[in-house]
Amino acid sequence: KAMHVAQPAVVLASSRGIASFVCEYASPGKATEVRVTVLRQADSQVTEVCAATYMMGNELTFLDDSICTGTSSGNQVNLTIQGLRAMDTGLYICKVELMYPPPYYLGIGNGTQIYVIDPEPCPDSD
């Protein structure tokens, strides 16, 4: 079953290569277990950035080596992606699945265009 997912159109990463955005889904029921996946689309290629599952009201659990962190509040997921460089600029799509209880719902956002600008190196001081 389909579900609506909303996310901001554009986000500018900080000078430290950190970008945060909110992924909000219109839950048709009372989900207790949710899976969130962030995918990057660039040059028609789609790659998985990170994925997490969480029980409603709990922290998101990403893999240990994940560049993502996040928190949840109701039907909102606050996602933060770290370690971004200019080459990581692209469309970051939020995918939400309501895993339990049945029925299973799937929603895919339109994507957040994240712009990353590498900081200029500091000039040497004499």
Partner: nanobody
Amino acid sequence: EVQLVESGGGLVQAGGSLRLSCAASGGTFSFYGMGWFRQAPGKEQEFVADIRTSAGRTYYADSVKGRFTISRDNAKNTVYLQMNSLKPEDTATYYCAAEMSGISGWDYWGQGTQVTVSS
């Protein structure tokens, strides 16, 4: 056109095992993910398990965790569901599904295979 064909269903006693297979045909392709869903008469569709190609990462519904194992053979474009310690509540039609890319959703579905667990 991609086709998914399931097999391996049947009637089994509680505590028994079955191995479902889902073969994809119709071309050479690399799926982002393949999974299994089930639906019992009069009940909502339930997610069972899936596996994502990128890292071979698997995910299971709590109701089957520790009893079911999903695996895939990329060379054969086939995904398997090994079901052990079956319970009467596992009785349902099991459907295989595949998604081409992570942002396409479950693009392709099989016709389903019936699993009946008697007590």
